[in-house]
């Protein structure tokens, strides 16, 4: 019950994150005009991954898109490919984790493979979320640049004043919402990676062909240890030996002429 | 690449009217927020007006609100500044700048420039 509970949360958890990845990359608000020195202003700019926007303080706003793909800061592309990657990878995530799902039956599906899936599905949220916040964070460090640049580049006016050469730019609202989204979806991906563990079965026993001989004498059963690797002991008290021509898991075995020592 | 070349500019009487132009080549103009700048001699360069990529948002210096008009003709590549009842104070070079990225106020935030246009305003 804990395990299918950890999973659905996990889903649900990275689900969201994933919209939030999507929101992010679309919305038009990574940098946003700094008004500290300009609070009254007639025009605010703000700027996302596709487009740049001016604002006039009516409330109409005009966007375009940017029209060059080549002409783009190197940087406003390394975030764009990091964001894309992180939506793709949740997207795929997403996929795998619904019939991961232990609450939905699909056929005669093994736990061990639900297992796998739910693993994989966690991996990629994971490295969804990674990319989300890297993505985010590499924006918001080129932001952080920028704006002490544009403060160190200040001169002193004619009338003393300080002003700046270029209007500077700060965090938006995408920023954070891409933030909060990367790690929802990281998290989600550990609670996933966490309800694997549940859903693995926790020893596997293979079948093994039983010898026995003609009267009620012992058979040696191979089957009664468990694979030769040293994992796991005896513990459900299981009879070695045997006289009876059963495999381990109790299905009848019919004898052949190859079972007679 | 754009290249700005900007004409119009001349000696003119206080109270007059002039109107300038910035016409754009290498690419087109529709693509660029476009804005006027004047430098005074011995003072900086400041911002005039700017208008966005259709023209349909304007920003104003408030020494200029009211008096001066920017506006712009894509299909011509043109951009305008329409200049009334000018007084000694506008006497400058008149430049005109283009930027895809936003409409900024600062000499900074444009990254082409026109070499200018002199404006020189008799009382």
């Known amino acids: 019950m804990a395990v299918t509970a950890c999973q659905g949360l996990g889903f649900v958890v990275s689900l969201i994150g994933i919209a939030g990845i999507i929101a992010a990359t679309c919305m038009d608000q990574w940098s946003t005009q700094d008004l500290y020195n300009n609070p009254v202003t007639a025009v605010f700019n703000y700027q996302g991954l596709w487009r740049s926007c001016v604002r006039e303080s009516s409330g109409f706003t005009e966007c375009r898109g940017y029209f060059t793909l080549l002409g783009l800061p190197a940087m406003l592309q390394a975030v764009r490919a990091l964001m894309i990657v992180g939506i793709v990878l949740g997207a795929i995530g997403l996929l795998v984790s619904i019939f991961a799902l232990k609450c939905i039956r699909i056929g005669s599906m093994e736990d061990s493979a639900k297992a796998n899936m739910t693993l994989t599905s966690g991996i990629m949220f994971i490295v969804s979320g990674l990319c989300a916040i890297a993505g985010v964070s590499v924006f918001a460090n080129m932001l952080v640049t920028n704006f002490w640049m544009s403060t160190a580049n200040m001169y002193t006016g004619m009338g003393g004043m300080v002003q700046t050469v270029q209007t500077r730019y700060t965090f938006g609202a995408a920023l954070f919402v891409g933030w909060v989204a990367g790690g929802l979806t990281l998290i989600g991906g550990v609670m996933m990676c966490i309800a694997c563990r549940g859903l693995a079965p926790e020893e596997t026993n293979y079948k093994a062909v039983s010898y026995h001989a003609s009267g009620h004498s012992v058979a040696y059963k191979p089957g009664g240890f468990k694979a030769s690797t040293g994992f796991g002991s005896n513990t459900k008290n299981k009879k070695i030996y045997d006289g009876g021509a059963r495999t381990e898991d109790e299905v009848q075995s019919y004898p052949s002429k190859h079972d007679y020592v | 690449q754009v290249q700005l070349v900007e004409s119009g500019g001349g000696l003119v009487q206080a109270g007059d009217s002039v109107r300038l132009s910035c016409a754009a080549s290498g690419q087109t103009l529709s693509n660029y927020n476009v804005a006027w700048f004047r430098q005074a001699p011995g003072k900086e360069r400041e911002f005039v007006a700017g208008a966005t990529w259709s023209g349909r948002i304007t920003n104003y210096s408030d020494s200029v609100r009211g008096r001066f008009t920017i506006s712009r003709d894509n299909a011509k590549n043109t951009v305008y500044l329409q200049m009334n009842s000018l007084g000694p104070g506008d006497t400058a070079v008149y430049h005109c700048?283009?930027?895809?990225?936003?409409?900024?106020?600062?000499?900074?935030?444009?990254?082409?420039w026109g070499q200018g246009t002199q404006v020189t305003v008799s009382s």
């Open positions: 700048a283009a930027n895809s990225f936003q409409l900024g106020d600062k000499p900074g935030d444009y990254h082409y």
